[in-house]
């Protein structure tokens, strides 16, 4: 079920890549983020908390991500025609609870001017 | 129905502590985490903190760090909100508010009917 | 601290009447949730994620905005609907509750 758009701005472009913003609600302690290109899992993220608060972030499907305490970014690199998709961000909420997911995302458009290696 | 009872009205002398309960019932008290919210005469609302109940985790506000205590007792679905070093400032209506989540965010979807708390010499 | 201001302070107006209540936000925010209370009462949840109505509330109630300017809409006034009126922001620690807009009789 896709619970809608995502409310702020998903995706930036920089050479020639694109960071994939994907953001939870900072209470959030432990979480699973996985970003989907249309129905295919490419990336994933689970952030869990142990005792003594000890945090431990692990990637089954690993992209190269970065982890604030409101947002998961997944960046993907050499940017072509294909990358043009609808993108989601998957999220599972486990703690605190109640266990939520959520699916938000949106299409991501490909142009010329983002396009890793131009021919000139 | 999902329902959150909170203790009777308390009178503190400023310096002491207060424990306030908040006993869940009409749902599984694990699957939800707890806030506390006071709300003092006449004044607007504010958040003291959060505690899950599935992992005892806790979130204070940090005006409350230090001086604000959250435990839970599984056995009897109770939340504890204890507040110490009492002042006048604290006299307050203190109020339990179950978790939940939208899309994007999270909110207080089930209230408790409220605590007073009086701090006075 | 994300300071929500909340406008106007009191709303005069009759049954049947259009209500509109601002919340501005002293910094982006992602969403809003508008609380309802009445004298004595907790407080009880109308608007989530800035405007999902939540369970039993009336279709009167609508909710709008982005970024820091966000409304609560009620289409048309009904008696139990004077009360106060409450933004609460959960975006930004520590998550923060405007002043409140009184709506009161006319």
């Known amino acids: 079920e896709i619970n809608g758009s995502a409310n702020y701005e998903m995706f930036i472009f920089h050479n020639g890549g694109v960071q994939i913003l994907c953001k939870y609600p900072d209470i959030v302690q432990q979480f699973k983020m996985q970003l989907l290109k249309g129905g295919q899992i490419l990336c994933d993220l689970t952030k869990t908390k142990g005792s003594g608060n000890t945090v431990s972030i692990k990637s089954l499907k690993f992209c190269h991500s970065q982890l604030s305490n409101n947002s998961v970014s997944f960046f993907l690199y050499n940017l072509d025609h294909s990358h043009a998709n609808y993108y989601f961000c998957n999220l599972s909420i486990f703690d605190p609870p109640p266990f939520k997911v959520t699916l938000t995302g949106g299409y991501l458009h490909i142009y010329e001017s983002q396009l890793c290696c131009q021919l000139k | 129905q999902v329902q959150l009872v909170q203790s009777g009205a308390e009178v503190k002398k400023p310096g002491s502590s207060v424990k306030v309960s908040c006993k869940a019932s009409?749902?599984?008290?694990?699957?939800?985490?707890m806030h506390w919210v006071r709300q003092a005469p006449g004044q607007g609302l504010e958040w003291i903190g959060l505690?899950?109940?599935?992992?005892?985790?806790?979130n204070y506000n940090q005006k409350f760090q230090g001086r604000a205590t959250m435990t839970v007792d599984k056995s009897t679905s109770t939340a504890y909100m204890e507040l110490s070093s009492l002042r006048s400032e604290d006299t307050a209506v203190y109020y339990c508010?179950?978790?939940?989540?939208?899309?994007?965010?999270?909110?207080?979807?089930?209230w408790g009917q409220g605590t007073t708390v009086t701090v006075s010499s | 601290e994300i300071v929500l201001t909340q406008s106007p302070a009191t709303l005069s107006l009759s049954p049947g009447e259009r209500a509109t209540l601002s919340c501005s936000a002293s910094?982006?925010?992602?969403?809003m949730h508008w609380y309802q209370q009445k004298p004595g009462q907790a407080p009880r949840l109308l608007i989530y994620?800035?405007?999902k109505l939540a369970s039993g509330i009336p279709a009167r109630f609508s909710g709008s905005g982005s970024g820091t300017d966000f409304t609560l809409t009620i289409s048309s006034l009904e008696p139990e609907d004077f009360a106060v009126y409450y933004c609460?922001?959960?975006?930004?620690?520590?998550?923060?509750f405007g002043q409140g807009t009184k709506l009161e009789i006319k």
């Open positions: 508010g179950r978790n939940n989540y939208g899309n994007y965010g999270w909110y207080f979807d089930v």
């Open positions: 009409g749902y599984t008290f694990t699957d939800y985490a």
């Open positions: 505690i899950s109940i599935y992992s005892d985790h806790t």
């Open positions: 910094s982006s925010v992602s969403y």
């Open positions: 994620d800035t405007s």
């Open positions: 609460f922001q959960g975006s930004g620690y520590p998550y923060t």
